[in-house]
């Protein structure tokens, strides 16, 4: 069953290659366990960036080697993606699934366009 998911249209990564955005879902059910997946769409190809399953009121737990971190508050998930470079610029889509208990709901946001600008290398300086 479908569920509405909202996320910002555009986000600019900072100079350290970190971008944060909020993914908000309109929960029609009484979900206690939620799965959040971040997908990247570039050149009509969609790849999974990271995913986490969390219990309502608890922290999101991504895999140890994940480039994502996040926190949850009610029906909002604050997602942070790290280690981004200019080549990672693209549309990052938030997918939310209400996993347990039934009924199962799934919603996909319209995506957040994340722009990443590689910092200029510092010029060598003579002392």
């Amino acid at each position: 069953k479908a569920m509405h998911v909202a996320q910002p249209a555009v986000v600019l990564a900072n100079s350290r290659g970190t971008a944060s955005f909020v993914c908000e879902y309109a929960s029609p059910g009484k979900a206690t366990e939620v799965r959040v997946t971040v997908l990247r769409q570039a050149d009509s190809q969609v790849t999974e960036v990271c995913a986490a399953t969390y219990m309502m009121g608890n922290e999101l737990t991504f895999l140890d080697d994940s480039i994502c971190t996040g926190t949850s508050s009610g029906n909002q998930v604050n997602l942070t993606i790290q280690g981004l470079r200019a080549m990672d610029t693209g549309l990052y889509i938030c997918k939310v699934e209400l996993m347990y208990p039934p009924p199962y709901y799934m919603g996909i946001g319209n995506g957040t366009q994340i722009y990443v600008i590689d910092p200029e290398p510092c010029p060598d300086s003579d002392f």
């Epitope: 206690t32 366990e33 399953t53 219990m55 347990y100 208990p101 039934p102 009924p103 199962y104 799934m106």
Partner: antibody, heavy 120, light 112 residues
């Protein structure tokens, strides 16, 4: 191939214990809730217990509450059912079941079942 | 006694249409929870036949259809065939029991 394989069934005396296992393969086990469903000889299906993907949420049927314990080891892709204080009425084929399609919460995957016989 | 009520048996001749009912309450079907239908052939594990009231998994013929209204649901089988002879179960989540509930099952016999 998506598969569930139960094991651990057998003959046990009333008051005894048994531990059932269900090995999963072919899907992201940790993402999905799992359930145990049983069927007594010649009878209908009865849901026994369910556990969320993380293992953080657990529910039991009233008929087994306080006697059965469901658990899962996501690192081993395995679901368990610890059955204590077994009674004759617990005699049944025990199935593990799940939904792994990401489209609904109906049980679209079932194991072949393992028979538990409680008799003296 | 099952939480969801089904007729214990149903029958029909090849080519006929048969309907199996499933009646629940305000804590399951009436609470808005979807009804799922399972087919169990003799000596085998149950198989998902209809999910979310009226949707068919791939591979299930369109002879099988489901519907839901209020606190009840029904499964219809048209163009009955001998291989449809099986037990049919409805199921739904129950809010007050915090668990899945099944109907008692309907044994479908294909006559002739």
């Amino acid at each position: 191939e998506v598969q569930l394989l139960e094991s651990g069934g057998g003959l046990v005396q009333p008051g005894g214990s048994l531990r059932l296992s269900c090995a999963a393969s072919g899907f992201t086990f940790s993402s999905y809730a799992m359930s145990w469903v049983r069927q007594a000889p010649g009878k209908g299906l009865e849901w026994v217990s369910g556990i969320s993907g993380s293992g953080g949420y657990i529910h039991y049927a009233d008929s087994v509450k306080g006697r059965f314990t469901i658990s899962r080891d996501n690192s081993k892709n395995t679901l368990y059912l610890q059955m204590n204080s077994l009674r004759a009425e617990d005699t049944a084929v025990y199935y593990c079941a799940t939904y792994s399609s990401g489209l609904h919460d109906a049980f679209d995957i079932w194991g072949q079942g393992t028979l538990v016989t409680v008799s003296s | 006694q099952s939480v969801l009520t089904q007729p214990p048996s149903a029958s029909g001749t090849p080519g006929q249409r048969v309907t199996i009912s499933c009646t629940g309450s305000s804590s399951n079907i009436g609470a808005g929870y979807d009804v799922h239908w399972y087919q169990q052939l003799p000596g085998t594990a149950p198989k998902l036949l209809i999910y979310d009231n009226n949707k068919r998994p791939s591979g299930v013929p369109d002879r099988f259809s489901g519907s839901k209204s209020g606190t009840s649901a029904s499964l219809a089988i048209s163009g009955l065939r001998s291989e449809d002879e099986a037990d049919y179960y409805c199921a739904a989540w129950d809010d007050s029991l915090n668990g899945w509930v099944f109907g008692g099952g309907t044994k479908l016999t294909v006559l002739g």
